[in-house]
Amino acid sequence: AAMGSCSKEYRMLLGQLQKQTDLMQDTSRLLDPYIRIQGLDIPKLREHCRESPGAFPSEETLRGLGRRGFLQTLNATLGCVLHRLADLEQHLPKAQDLERSGLNIEDLEKLQMARPNVLGLRNNVYCMAQLLDNSDMTEPTKAGRGTPQPPTPTPTSDVFQRKLEGCSFLRGYHRFMHSVGRIFSKWGESPNRSRR
């Protein structure tokens, strides 16, 4: 849905959530550009870019939640993701620096689209919660009560280490979105059932 407005049509809203998560699990939209821009696109360095265990809820955990609980967890996790993406963006090279080093400006543009995309998804998560009559959900623009803090990068002066941590975070993010997409794809044609 357009930011700030909510569709009352369950299947259209679910379709939008399915489409957004479908696109967000695609590594070519975020992880791959990040790896190229940060100079990690070398087999030996790529090996170090592994997902940190426990950084995101597992698919098994998500599947054990009812629809409302799932949406609340997703909303909270996306809040963390927004904080972390903002942190990553601060450490990206500037456009002119990219051009000087012969890197693709389109990669930077893809990375800069990540936060607006997450905001759009979060807005639709909020709308779906409204549609399922979930009064506990905080609005996507506000910090939620009990929202976990974003995973804090290890304090380090090592720029390379920070790049690897960003890489690990994005790998986990794509895996998480894949899990979320699989769950949304199982949601049926009717909004009535609270558990799958």
Epitope: M12, Q16, Q18, K19, G120
Partner: antibody, heavy 120, light 106 residues
Framework: QVQLKQSGPGLVQPSQSLSITCTVS????????VHWVRQSPGKGLEWLGV???????DYNAAFMSRLSITKDNSRSQVFFKMNSLQADDTAIYYC??????????????WGTGTTVTVSS | QIVLTQSPTIMSASPGEKVTMTCSGS?????MYWYQEKPGSSPRLLIE???NLASGVPARFSGSGSGTSYSLTISRMEAEDAATYYC?????????FGSGTKLEIK
């Protein structure tokens, strides 16, 4: 190869109903939604409605009172019926396939089209 | 409902020329979809999710945009690209189409 072939009358009397059958091949109606769109010189392309893989339907509010979409999965057929046609319902009517099993409201393959003229 | 306004309504281009047409929404939309229609044929999906080429579509086609402003570009016009192009959104109910841009070959 995915195909949607349409059959239906070319001429409909005013106030009568229009029935079109969309017969699909290359995919199963249990896996994909089928939408209906019409195209007229005056109003351009208009989305009319959809029947999803599980059989539920969504209709454009402007046509809801006179539109019905049903299907027979075993015969790979979708049935479109619109009542009380008037001259401004003259258009080409298309069935079109949703691109995957999710609730996607756009169309990756379109039917052959049925040209409908409403006239006495 | 969201109204999509396409411009120009009609345009012509020479073979090899770069072509850009736009689609403007009355409200913000998440993604835009583009279709190509040739006389006597059914519409064909060209671009999905704003910038992804649909299956079998030549790489000279590209899409971009966000919010209320989207565009379709043909990097080098070819004779077979003469057609009418429609944009479509489904961010808001009901799905709606633009009124089309007719592209002719010079």
């Amino acid at each position: 190869q995915v195909q949607l072939k349409q059959s239906g009358p070319g001429l409909v009397q005013p106030s009568q109903s229009l029935s079109i059958t969309c017969t699909v091949s290359g995919f199963s109606l249990t896996n994909y939604g089928v939408h209906w769109v019409r195209q007229s010189p005056g109003k351009g392309l208009e989305w009319l409605g959809v029947i999803w893989r599980g059989g539920s339907t969504d209709y454009n509010a402007a046509f809801m009172s006179r539109l019905s979409i049903t299907k027979d999965n075993s015969r790979s057929q979708v049935f479109f019926k619109m009542n009380s046609l008037q001259a401004d319902d003259t258009a080409i009517y298309y069935c079109a396939k949703s691109p995957n099993s999710n609730f996607y409201w756009y169309f990756d393959v379109w039917g052959t089209g049925t040209t409908v003229t409403v006239s006495s | 409902q969201i109204v999509l306004t396409q411009s120009p309504t009609i345009m012509s281009a020479s073979p090899g020329e770069k072509v850009t047409m736009t689609c403007s929404g009355s409200s913000s939309v998440s993604y835009m979809y583009w279709y190509q229609e040739k006389p006597g044929s059914s519409p064909r999906l060209l671009i999905e999710d704003t910038s992804n080429l649909a299956s079998g579509v030549p790489a000279r086609f590209s899409g971009s945009g966000s919010g209320t402003s989207y565009s379709l570009t043909i990097s080098r016009m070819e004779a077979e690209d003469a057609a009418t192009y429609y944009c479509q959104q489904w961010s808001s109910y009901p799905p709606t189409f633009g009124s089309g841009t007719k592209l002719e070959i010079k």
